[in-house]
């Protein structure tokens, strides 16, 4: 049994048939020593009486908030909670493998330029009684300040019967130079709590290989004199690191037709202009990637060619 | 990624280009070796990231750009101490911290280029002859630190007397190769900068 | 989703005693309490007996305290009500449940899983 955070305590379970469980001592935080009681999760039911309380705990019913009281006083709490381990691997149920870029992947992390700012985001299926709390550090064995948000909720999708949930959390390095060489992996540890089921997530990058930029901005077309062809131009998107001349981008330009079959012409260019050919319905598409280091392509930015 | 590329222009920074062609020849050996040694953990999630040039050059510092400077945390540690003359300066007024950037790159590539061959001499006595250096890539570090023309003494090629042990070696370049990728990307950033500049 | 499938109901003389069992499959490692609730017919289905988790706390109205015990052999996954000193008001049908939910362990509301029910007729 460990301490997640004041009052709150999480009891490890090998998980099989006849599992002995864990046998847990509580003690009432009071200098008092007589005719203490106490209850869980809110029913009026004495489950015994004393300064300690001794309950085995063999599953997650064995849980909740035990509370000691004297007199109708509320004296301390105890939120006990379960991590589940089963054949030796701790339970992932609350949140979903994306299995990208490879299976067990519940966490993932983006970030759009060098400043030490991430994202991470995560999904699940749970609807109530569900809330995270995120830690992030630079390196694990002499962690370097990453300072996170609060996760929210931020956005809801509906998968078949299901209804899926992302949410995701914002992070900042204390002290991140955007020049700097990484040499320890940002490591960032989810804590999961649905009801009383306790399990930790954790992720593991260099802020180089979760790169990926905004789309290009301010895109447009100059058609030429007497010809098919238009001059495309764009500029770095504004989120990305300064100088550009320093953290420079390599773009591709693509021109796809109206119909996903039509064969797309692709253009690859270190500039920020590129001459093509336009055809009629056709859309003219750009997006970026760091010019010397191939994390992820933006996402597109596209205009008509009409 | 396999894009074409557009040469660069005759009368642009001459390190440039042997810069682009480090970095393409860096990355082209170090997805060879993790190819190669697919049952070795050499995937950038399985090894110690180690710097050979760790307290021995500052290229970062050095080469950090003007409009950086400013980031409290990109100036822990600037060193002063290089040595200020070399051919990719001399059509252009260039600053001290501009001679301590690109003489710092140069002993980078010095430091990789001695600890490459050593390893390459321990691969070619492999029974199993799995992997080698590309000689493409020892060319190319060559050839920038020609362009980059600093006079500095030559470092001895270092040599064991004792049986190589191939696993660790093997190991070693992993570690070596991604540590020279991110080095190599450092650089052509660099380049890059001055080039606008 | 946890299935549950009671037995041992029947036609007994008041005073005596029946143990009813109910089996639980599926995802049953999810669930904070199991119960046993009864519906005379016109009534409303009112609570007898819910065992927290492997029996850290057990709770019963004051209608049967000390009449009806309530156990679990979590190895089995199975849990038992014991009534003895049965009345004619004890007829009824009985049904287990089991529920997720931390609160409110006596409200029938709040469980999410229901077995089919078995009849228990108290009569001379």
């Known amino acids: 049994i460990w301490e997640l955070k004041k009052d709150v305590y999480v009891v490890e379970l090998d998980w099989y048939p006849d599992a002995p469980g864990e046998m847990v001592v509580l003690t009432c935080d009071t200098p008092e020593e007589d005719g203490i009681t106490w209850t869980l999760d809110q029913s009026s039911e004495v489950l015994g009486s004393g300064k300690t309380l001794t309950i085995q705990v063999k599953e997650f019913g064995d849980a909740g908030q035990y509370t000691c009281h004297k007199g109708g006083e509320v004296l301390s709490h105890s939120l006990l909670l379960l991590h589940k381990k089963e054949d030796g691997i701790w339970s992932t149920d609350i949140l979903k493998d994306q299995k990208e870029p490879k299976n067990k992947t519940f966490l993932r992390c983006e970030a759009k330029n060098y400043s030490g700012r991430f994202t991470c985001w995560w999904l699940t299926t749970i609807s109530t009684d569900l809330t995270f709390s995120v830690k992030s550090s630079r390196g694990s064995s002499d962690p370097q300040g990453v300072t996170c948000g609060a996760a929210t909720l931020s956005a809801e999708r509906v998968r078949g019967d299901n209804k899926e949930y992302e949410y995701s959390v914002e992070c900042q390095e204390d002290s991140a130079c955007p020049a700097a060489e990484e040499s320890l992996p940002i490591e960032v540890m989810v804590d999961a709590v649905h009801k009383l089921k306790y399990e930790n997530y954790t992720s593991s990058f260099f802020i180089r290989d979760i790169i990926k930029p905004d789309p290009p901005k301010n895109l447009q077309l100059k058609p030429l004199k007497n010809s098919r062809q238009v001059e495309v131009s764009w500029e770095y998107p504004d989120t990305w690191s300064t100088p550009h001349s320093y953290f420079s981008l390599t773009f591709c330009v693509q021109v796809q037709g109206k119909s996903k079959r039509e064969k797309k012409d692709r253009v690859f260019t270190d500039k920020t202009s590129a001459t093509v050919i336009c055809r009629k319905n056709a859309s003219i598409s750009v997006r970026a990637q760091d010019r010397y280091y191939s994390s992820s392509w933006s996402e597109w930015a596209s205009v008509p060619c009409s | 990624r396999n894009l074409p590329v557009a040469t660069p222009d005759p009368g642009m920074f001459p390190c440039l280009h042997h810069s682009q062609n480090l970095l393409r020849a860096v990355s082209n050996m170090l997805q060879k070796a993790r190819q190669t040694l697919e049952f070795y953990p050499c995937t950038s999630e399985e090894i110690d990231h180690e710097d050979i040039t760790k307290d021995k050059t500052s290229t970062v510092e050095a080469c950090l750009p003007l409009e950086l400077t400013k980031n409290e945390s990109c100036l822990n540690s600037r060193e002063t101490s290089f040595i200020t003359n070399g051919s990719c300066l001399a059509s252009r007024k260039t600053s001290f911290m501009m001679a301590l950037c690109l003489s710092s790159i140069y002993e980078d590539l010095k430091m990789y280029q001695v600890e490459f061959k050593t390893m390459n001499a321990k691969l070619l006595m492999d029974p199993k002859r799995q992997i080698f250096l590309d000689q493409n890539m020892l060319a190319v570090i060559d050839e920038l630190m020609q362009a980059l023309n600093f006079n500095s003494e030559t470092v001895p090629q270092k040599s064991s007397l004792e049986e190589p042990d191939f696993y660790k070696t093997k190991i070693k370049l992993c570690i070596l190769l991604h540590a020279f990728r991110i080095r190599a990307v450092t650089i052509d950033r660099v380049m890059s900068y001055l080039n606008a500049s | 989703e946890v299935q549950l499938v009671e037995s041992g109901g029947g036609l007994v003389q008041p005073g005596g005693s029946l143990r009813l069992s109910c089996a639980a499959s599926g995802r049953t490692f999810e669930t904070i309490a199991m119960g046993w609730f009864r519906q005379a017919p016109g009534k409303e289905r009112e609570f007898v007996a819910v065992?927290?988790?492997?029996?850290?706390?057990?709770y019963y109205p004051e209608s049967v305290k000390g009449r009806f015990t309530i156990s679990k052999d979590s190895s089995k996954n199975t849990v038992y009500l014991q009534m003895n000193s049965l009345r004619a008001e004890d007829t009824a049908v009985y049904y287990c449940a089991a529920t997720t939910n931390r609160f409110k362990n006596t409200d029938y509301t709040t469980y999410d899983y229901w077995g089919q029910g078995t009849q228990v007729t108290v009569s001379s």
């Open positions: 065992i927290r988790g492997s029996g850290v706390a057990t």
